[in-house]
């Protein structure tokens, strides 16, 4: 498909001249940021961004790549080097430590320097590193964590926890020896390490004692409470704050977010991770966009500002399953949340960053025609005279041999939300990829986001922009309209 | 491998604070660019950049990812949307039209708007678009094209040619019907469309009549001249300029570049594409770095400045072969050329851009240990109980079934320069990928390179920075030290 207007050079020349005009008008703001928002697309490498852009465009009846994601509109871009201290290709724990605490750690550890060793409890103490969220709280800001995964998952945990094992969600996951040495599960740290004003996502089961039925799955024992210590962490958290409220469904969330008496809000909408967007029951579970809006309504009441972490956490899960449909629809909802946040905040006083913790071995090739489905087939056949999809994985569970050969695929098969794209190597879970990821920035001090940087730079930019530790002597003018 | 110094949070905090300090010091230059250099890494997607960084670092006995490529030091980064008007995943012809002429075209066409149709000669006339190089020449600057491919290849041809078929290298490649309609081969256009001061790369055979033996391969008929029109285009080109010189080996190139009587230089060092860097005979063929240096020595004599196109063109070829070793060693040489150019020019008066025309379905995953070979194996085994490499392709010629199963691989096999990484789908040639590529910028007006842009933006930034058409009223201060 060739759009007629694009045949005319004037179309491109005019468009570029406009882009140039916008670039010339860009003025670095010399003010401090009152508010900080970091949007984390878990596993959202550049190939995922592009494919999601095309899909989002096509859902709006456009050809695809010419459209804009909300993140595409952010004026500043950098590349972030995601390796962990011990691995070329990192996990979401070590990377969370980097972009949230400003220090690189080791694979599968969270909130700890690289002096800590995976799974070795006794290497925890003394190696804790403090997140920007924690520093924001100490500076009097309100803080929040919003995710589509369980709230105790690696990425959000980087904002509040310190653990040598990212899988220690509840005490039932922590070996007895580690518990005896004083290592706390992540759920416990969620409510005890610091005061978090808004906590929204999944992860109910880690908060309740073993045997507590789940309100949504009362007959499913596997979805009920997992704790061995008998603690009801939700109850403990509610007891800490007079204006605290706990909700577990969408209706309650929307009510709470509009209730001026609510000062602290915890919403846990699934026992584990939240549902994929394509599987979400919108009558019970809020979308990432809705959770983001609810969080912003509460946090923005603080005249000193806020710090908010928003994670599209299941982009990563879709890729691990080699189900690009899931990964890309998650990315679109993540982008929708970015768009809504932009409508609810001002770039005069809010520094917004969008980035990924790492990428995936996910590619988009094969010379498909413009306007063709992102989930479709490449033109022509492969060397084995079979069709192949434009989306493919380097490794993962999509590798199948049928009668000793690669299976054929049809357009209707490849378009199914359940379809697993093929891969070169068979793995139970497709792996992360180690290439640089993009950082998109808008708002005060966003111009500092430039060039190729270590992933740790992200935390430092946020801290500097809001004059948080260690940059309290930041020498930035207070933002316009500050009330503090 | 965990470097001891990296275990200390101070290491990361100090490093980030320094990066922040550098970011704060960045001052957009308000001057015009006297010189323009565009470095084009053909097929150099972000995954290629990262893998090459690790390899370059490891060649210097470092662990890898913590090191810097020359391009990593460029202060400004943007993302470029590479689709062509008719394809989600483009080729090097349509993309060359975008970043060199500022207008998007159709797959496999060059220097033409999208009103032109592939292979249809009669859609050429009236749809030509003019490159920034051409405009620079008209403004009195010297201009040059340097590539490791044949100089008539798609990317360099974007600087000077207009053709509905990128494969029309010499008249022997052009169908008789198209020749009768007046469509010229690219080699003819190279010497007749505009006055190019420096032309360095491969592509000898397209310049000479059929039957002309090649000086380097005199007994190999397939390497000799291909032209049917009996023309010796090198001779014709030499006749146009009193100070013109033609060279075909490294020694002659180095001599000519230092000879003040040489005003125009054509160096064609292979009949077709130049050798891969790992196969290059350094006594006969210059490296990309040496060609770049030679070009800069000549071009920088012009007080009005210059435009230079430098292409690492065989990064792409290595990937098409699914031979990552070739692609990455080509990328390192490309980066070396960028580094050398930086030493020979000043960012006060020279706008340098580094980008790719498109990416490849090339990924780097599998959680390898830091410091392990980029060509090595992932830890653990795949689901088929066999080893697998960290580098893989989505599609390509590395797909092999041995006795109806995926072949095993050893570290020594995977480290071979000839090894083809496995792929999910068997193709004769691995395909391009459609995700956004990076644009790195340094020098006057480099700050305009920001955010997510259409690939066409690159040409417009160059034109604006140097006050070329259509931005002659650019309202920029002349660069410091101008002599014009």
């Amino acid at each position: 498909i060739i759009p007629v207007e694009e045949e005319n050079p004037d179309f491109w020349n005019r468009q570029a001249a406009e882009a140039l005009g916008a670039a010339k008008k860009l003025q670095p703001a010399q003010t401090a940021a009152k508010n900080l928002i970091i949007f984390l697309g878990d596993g959202m490498g550049v190939s995922t961004v592009t494919a999601a852009r095309i899909l989002k465009g096509q859902k709006k009846d456009k050809l695809g790549p010419e459209t804009f994601l909300a993140m595409d509109r952010f004026p500043y871009v950098a590349l972030s080097k995601t390796y962990s201290v011990d691995k070329h290709v990192p996990d979401s724990g070590a990377t969370a430590t980097a972009y949230l605490c400003g220090v690189k750690g080791n694979f599968q550890t969270i909130g700890l320097s690289a002096a800590a060793r995976f799974n070795q409890c006794n290497t925890t103490r003394g190696n804790e590193v403090i997140s920007v969220m924690n520093r924001a709280k100490k500076a009097g800001k309100s803080v929040g964590v919003v995710t589509t995964t369980r709230v105790q998952h690696a990425s959000p945990a980087g904002a509040y926890a310190h653990t040598v094992n990212r899988n220690w969600y509840s005490d039932a996951d922590v070996p007895a020896s580690a518990r005896q040495e004083g290592c706390q599960d992540i759920a416990t740290q969620l409510i005890s390490n610091m005061d978090i004003d808004v906590i929204l996502g999944g992860g109910r089961k880690y908060m309740f004692p073993m045997g507590t039925p789940d309100p949504e799955y009362p007959d499913d024992y596997s979805q009920g409470g997992t704790r061995l210590d008998g603690k009801n962490l939700v109850q403990e958290w509610l007891a800490k704050h007079q204006g605290a409220r706990y909700v577990w469904n969408r209706t309650e969330l929307l009510q709470a977010s509009l209730d001026p008496s609510v000062t602290h809000l915890m919403g846990l909408f699934e026992p584990g991770d939240m549902k994929y967007e394509i599987h979400r029951d919108s009558t019970l579970d809020p979308s990432l966009m809705e959770m983001t809006e609810a969080a912003l309504l509460l946090l923005s009441r603080n005249p000193r500002g806020f710090f908010l972490f928003v994670e599209g956490g299941r982009i990563d899960h879709g890729h691990h399953e080699s189900r690009a449909y899931r990964a890309l629809t998650e990315t679109i909802m993540f982008d929708d949340a970015i768009e809504r946040a932009g409508q609810l905040t001002s770039e005069e006083d809010t520094l917004s960053l969008v980035t990924a913790d790492h990428s995936h071995v996910f590619s988009f090739g094969g010379y498909p025609l413009r306007g063709s489905s992102i989930f479709g087939l490449a033109p022509g056949k492969a060397r084995d005279r079979k069709a192949y999809t434009v989306l493919l994985y380097g490794n993962g569970p999509g590798y199948v041999l049928k009668d000793g050969a690669r299976p054929d695929v049809t357009e209707s098969e490849s378009g199914s939300p359940e379809y697993r794209q093929q891969s070169a190597v068979p793995l139970d879970g497709e792996t992360h990829a180690g290439e640089d990821v993009a950082v998109f920035a808008r708002g005060p001090q966003a111009h500092l986001v430039h060039g190729v940087q270590e992933q740790t730079f992200i935390a430092h930019v946020m801290a500097f922009a809001a004059c948080l530790e260690p940059y309290t002597a930041c020498d930035l003018a207070p933002r316009a309209g500050t009330t503090d | 491998i965990i470097p001891v110094e990296e275990e200390n949070p101070d290491f990361w905090n100090r490093q980030a604070a320094e990066a922040l300090g550098a970011a704060k010091k960045l001052q957009p230059a308000q001057t015009a660019a006297k010189n323009l250099i565009i470095f084009l890494g053909d097929g150099m997607g972000v995954s290629t950049v990262t893998a090459a960084r690790i390899l370059k670092g490891q060649k210097k006995d470092k662990l890898g990812p913590e090191t810097f490529l020359a391009m990593d030091r460029f202060p400004y980064v943007a993302l470029s949307k590479t689709y062509s008007v008719d394809k989600h995943v483009p080729d090097s012809g349509a993309t060359a039209t975008a970043y060199l002429c500022g207008v998007k075209g159709n797959f496999q066409t060059i220097g033409l708007s999208a009103a032109a149709r592939f292979n249809q000669c009669n859609t050429t006339r009236g749809n030509e678009v003019i490159s920034v190089m051409n405009r620079a020449k008209k403004a009195g600057k010297s201009v040059g094209v340097v590539t490791t491919t044949r100089v008539q290849h798609a990317s360099p041809a974007g600087a000077y040619a207009h053709t509905v078929n990128r494969n029309w290298y010499s008249d022997a490649d052009v169908p008789a019907s198209a020749r009768q309609e007046g469509c010229q081969d690219i080699a003819t256009q190279l010497i007749s469309n505009m006055d190019i001061d420096v032309i360095l790369g491969g592509g000898r055979k397209y310049m000479f009549p059929m039957g002309t033996p090649d000086p380097e391969y005199p007994d190999d008929y397939s390497q000799g001249g291909t032209r049917l029109d009996g023309k010796n285009l090198v001779q014709e080109w030499l006749a146009k300029h009193q100070g013109a010189r033609y060279v075909w080996n490294r020694t002659e190139l180095l001599q000519a570049s230092l000879d003040p009587s040489v005003t125009h230089l054509m160096g064609l060092f292979e009949p077709g594409d130049m050798k891969y860097e790992i196969h290059r005979d350094s006594t006969l063929d210059p490296s990309l770095m040496e060609m770049t240096e030679a070009a800069l020595l000549l071009l920088s004599r012009n007080p009005r400045g210059f435009f230079l196109f430098v292409e690492g063109g065989r990064i792409d070829h290595g990937h098409h072969e699914s031979r990552a070793y070739r692609a990455l060693t080509e990328t390192i040489m490309f980066d070396d050329a960028i580094e050398r150019a930086g030493q020979l020019t000043s960012e006060e008066d020279t706008l340098s851009l580094v980008t790719a025309d498109h990416s490849h379905v090339f990924s780097f995953g599998g959680y390898p240990l830091r410091g392990s070979s980029i060509f090595g194996l992932a830890p653990g085994k795949a689901r088929d109980r066999k080893a697998y490499t960290v580098l893989l392709y989505g599609n390509g010629p590395g797909y092999v079934l041995k006795d109806g199963a995926r072949p095993d691989v050893t570290e020594s096999e995977s480290g071979s320069p000839e090894y083809r990484q496995q792929s999910a789908v068997p193709l004769d040639g691995e395909t391009h990928a459609g995700e956004d590529v990076a644009v790195f910028a340094r020098g006057p007006q480099a700050h305009l390179v920001h955010g997510v842009q259409e690939q066409t933006f690159i040409a417009h930034v160059m034109a604006f920075a140097a006050c070329l058409e259509p931005y002659t009223a650019c309202d920029l201060a002349p660069r410091a030290g101008t002599t014009d």
């Epitope: 209706t251 394509i278 029951d281 919108s282 | -």
Partner: antibody, heavy 117, light 111 residues
């Protein structure tokens, strides 16, 4: 008091089109889906489709209904069901119901559609 | 996605027990998006059980739902005359979008 009421049922000829409306009173549709169900005389309940009136506005229809039946939210308290190319087999009482999770808690009394020449 | 309800008709004496089965051709959403409805002639259906086993408000505890995944049961104990009606199961499924299906219905006759 919360209620749903269907309207628009009629006697129509084969091949005709008809639009049914479901009107909510005492509440808005922003936290529920609205689903359509029909029941031919003396037969069981048959799901037609649902409208996500909560967030996306997406519609989901039974495979047999796709193409002939469409639904839309027309206000915060009304949704419509458009039916085309009606045949005698479409003669039934048409119900709308509100859905939260696995609960279809509130149903309208139904409206009768008769297709006959 | 099909829900097979058995039996199609059942009779019981007052005070007796009725068991109705509902089998899904694939797992329902969340393994528990199965609800039961009672319909009397000339009336719309009335919700009895949701989430496979949770009693709707105002419904007597004589009605009990059980099951998970693909197999579900509605048990009416201490049957009363007022329980004479047709009972339907309703399942929700998600694959390529949402899909709902009713069982064929079970007529309960009270003697």
């Amino acid at each position: 008091q919360e209620q749903l009421k269907e309207s628009g049922g009629d006697l129509v000829k084969p091949g005709a089109s008809l639009t049914l409306t479901c009107t909510a009173s005492g509440f808005t549709l922003s936290t529920y889906w609205v689903c359509w169900v029909r029941q031919a005389p003396g037969k069981g309940l048959e799901w037609i489709g649902c409208i996500d009136t909560v967030s996306s506005g997406d519609t989901y229809f039974a495979s047999w209904a796709k193409g002939r039946f469409t639904g839309s939210k027309t206000s915060s308290t009304t949704v419509t069901l458009q039916m085309t190319s009606l045949t005698a087999a479409d003669t039934a009482t048409y119900f709308c119901a509100r859905r939260t999770g696995s609960r279809w808690t509130l149903w309208g009394p139904g409206t009768l559609v008769t297709v006959s020449s | 996605q099909v829900l097979t309800q058995t039996p199609s008709s059942v009779s019981a004496g007052v005070g007796g027990t009725v068991t109705i089965n509902c089998q899904a051709s694939e797992s329902v959403y969340n393994n528990n998006y199965l609800s039961w409805y009672q319909q009397k002639p000339g009336q719309p259906p009335k919700l009895l059980i949701y989430q496979a086993s949770t009693l709707a408000s105002g419904v007597p505890s004589r009605f009990k739902g059980s099951g998970s995944g693909t197999q579900f049961t509605l048990t009416i104990s201490d049957v009363q005359c007022d329980d004479a009606a047709t009972y339907y199961c309703l399942g929700a499924f998600v694959s390529n979008g949402w899909y709902f299906a009713f069982g064929g219905g079970t007529e309960v006759v009270v003697k």
